[in-house]
């Protein structure tokens, strides 16, 4: 008799794939454009990334540091009208992309939360949650919660409103903090909150430290759903050298939880390579004409157009990983087991019941390494086979689909491998 199948966990839409942040509509669209109507025209691109949700804005009216001239119910006319927003929502729904609205109040000002008028602002947020839920948004984001007085209490209240409307609605809180104590304290008192933080950006880009941060976080949060990113808003290139971008994409897509990216992460968008562009929101490089300021500054391989035509590009890797993440049970909701593979390496297994299993091996170092996979660290339910098929490598040159002997696994500098192997009873 075949063994009983493990009961599938209840999965919300944000469990099924990545979220994509567009914090600055103008920078995302470029060419002096940057409104909701223009964004609607980019939804096909978002579909091609296989992302499940779009975190948008803030787009509400906000006169810098003026609480009286901040209206969370009104869209800033520079971005469009309520009708444009409704139209965007409808189009996004048709493409199965959920829309999360950022309601960080004073996004143009010094202090995101008008620290001297917290109660006034909190009331505005409450009204806005109810208004935009009725309008059909799928969730909300609020950032810089480290500056929000009594954040935990307010978030609990806002979570109640959001979940009270529908269990299918999401509240995301963002912080620049990387303090695990504060993170865990907030998560303990706000059960279904999704939190983005700078926790992982402290990793110092080493395998041992990253492994330690990830496992510490997962052990501490237990079986609650979490999200993975390097910050609440910034690009991966703000924290990582170019040679580690592929490795981090592979890791973020294969850890248990929701990966959260900022627009441009999929192409390695780097403000430092675009003179005069703001670090927090550089112009998106759709093609070579997206940054006309300095002729020749942008080459084809830095753009969406150029990378779309190159199967070995970062964008192509992002699309493949996003696709795998959204359809493989072991990556959707599988168990996670990290184990030793040698200095500089971080390796783990994702597995769910009798479904295909995945092995991830990441070499954070700048020298090639032989992986000494310590299978003895793993529980019996997650044992390693002698060979596994190479699904993809972050570096070109490997033959995909070929079986690799796990005892003789060698990784190039900064290489990450995603291998698959079948369940064996």
């Amino acid at each position: 008799r075949a063994p009983r199948c493990r009961e599938l966990p209840a999965q919300k839409w944000w469990h099924t794939g990545a979220l994509y942040r567009i914090g600055d509509l103008q920078a995302f669209q470029g060419h002096g454009a940057g409104n909701l109507a223009g964004l609607k025209g980019r939804l096909d691109y978002l579909s091609s990334l296989k992302v499940k949700g779009l975190v948008l804005g803030p787009i509400h009216k906000n006169q810098k540091d003026d609480v009286a001239q901040t209206d969370l119910l009104q869209i800033d006319p520079n971005f469009g009208s309520k009708e444009d927003f409704d139209s965007l929502l409808q189009s996004a729904k048709k493409k199965s992309i959920r829309v999360i609205l950022d309601l960080t109040p004073n996004y143009r000002g010094e202090n995101s939360w008008f620290s001297t008028q917290v109660d006034t602002v909190a009331t505005k947020v409450k009204d806005a949650l109810e208004f935009w839920l009725q309008a059909g948004v799928d969730g909300f984001q609020v950032r810089d919660i480290e500056n929000l007085k009594d954040a935990s209490s307010f978030l609990a209240e806002w979570q109640n409103i959001t979940k009270g409307f529908s269990e299918d609605r999401l509240l995301i809180a963002g912080t620049n903090s990387s303090d695990l104590q504060q993170i865990l304290s907030l998560l303990e008192s706000n059960k279904d909150l999704l939190l983005t933080s700078s926790y992982l950006s402290d990793s110092g880009s080493t395998g041992e430290h990253t492994k330690s941060l990830v496992t510490q976080y997962l052990n501490a949060t237990g079986n609650r759903w979490c999200s993975w990113s390097l910050s609440q808003a910034r690009l991966l290139t703000s924290f990582l050298p170019a040679q580690l971008l592929r490795l981090y994409q592979l890791m973020l897509f294969t850890l248990p939880g929701t990966p959260v990216f900022s627009y441009g992460d999929e192409i390695g968008l780097d403000a430092a390579a675009l003179p005069g562009q703001p670090m927090e929101a550089p112009v998106m490089l759709w093609d070579e004409s997206s940054f006309p300021d300095i002729p020749g500054a942008v080459s084809a391989n830095m753009t969406v157009k150029g990378q779309s035509e190159d199967p070995g590009s970062l964008l192509s890797l992002f699309r493949r990983l996003s696709d795998q993440r959204s359809k493989e049970r072991s990556l959707l909701h599988g168990d996670f087991h990290a184990f030793s593979a040698g200095p500089g390496l971080f390796s783990y297994i994702r597995h769910w019941d009798q479904n295909e299993r995945f092995l991830v091996v990441l070499n954070f170092g700048d020298v090639g390494l032989s992986a000494g996979l310590q299978a003895s660290d793993l529980p019996a339910s997650a044992s390693l086979p002698a060979k596994a098929d190479l699904l993809l490598s972050t570096q070109p040159g490997r033959e995909e689909g070929s079986p690799l002997e796990l005892e003789r696994l060698k990784l190039e500098p900064h290489e990450g491998l995603l291998l698959r192997f079948p369940y064996a009873a």
Partner: antibody
């Protein structure tokens, strides 16, 4: 109004033990991390312990690790500090304080309770 | 551990004066600093959190500034109730650490 009231301080011999308490009111106790901070007779401030809102995670400086235990009873709105294997350098005024939690960073303090370690 | 060097350790000023107290951290603390007030024989009161944010009920003559490793607390138009001890605290990294304190006395 937020109120924190410590109790339990006493004169204890070196090597002895004691349990300090802090009764909280005026806020949703279970939503906040809580900490103990001490002030030495020379008026120097030292962080002693922190516990997360649900009580699952605790943090200590090396100077008290293994000797002090922080706990909480959210149903009773009470924070505790169990101190043991006491040394003379533990002599101080012990304060209970709210935070650090996001947006709340040691914002409210109790009036303190005195612990004297002496033979 | 992060060392918080607070200066001056004591100062005297007159009513109506503006004074500044500084704290230097031994490494960058990304605005994860608070300022506390302790009146003689009393407990502590939070004044400023995250470098610049005023705690509830704190008069606007108190302000905080700084970035990286250097921060300051400024009190403008000193009033009689402001003469007290002031401490900075960093909560960027464990163990949380405090400055040595500044005693502000009336001239």
């Amino acid at each position: 109004d937020v109120k924190l009231v410590e109790s339990g301080g006493d004169l204890v011999k070196p090597g002895g033990s004691l349990k300090l308490s802090c009764a909280a009111s005026g806020f949703t106790f279970s939503s906040y991390s809580m900490s103990w901070v001490r002030q030495t007779p020379e008026k120097r401030l030292e962080w002693v312990a922190t516990i997360t809102s649900g009580g699952s995670y605790t943090y200590f400086p090396d100077s008290v690790k293994g000797r002090f235990t922080i706990s909480r009873d959210n149903a009773k709105n009470t924070l505790y500090l169990q101190v043991s294997n006491l040394k003379s350098e533990d002599t101080a005024m012990y304060y209970c304080t709210r935070g650090p939690s996001f947006g709340n960073y040691l914002d409210y303090w109790g009036q303190g309770t005195t612990l004297t370690v002496s033979s | 551990d992060i060392l918080m060097t607070q200066s001056p350790s004591s100062m005297s000023a007159s009513l109506g004066d503006t004074v500044s107290i500084t704290c230097h951290a031994s490494q960058g603390i990304s605005s994860n600093i608070g300022w506390l007030q302790q009146k003689p024989g009393k407990s502590f009161k939070g004044l400023i959190y995250r470098g610049t944010n005023l705690e509830d009920g704190v008069p606007s003559r108190f302000s905080g500034s700084g970035s990286g490793a250097d921060y300051s607390l400024t009190i403008s138009s000193l009033e009689s109730e402001d003469f007290a001890d002031y401490y900075c605290v960093q909560y960027a990294h464990f163990p949380y650490t405090f400055g040595g304190g500044t005693k502000l006395e009336i001239k």
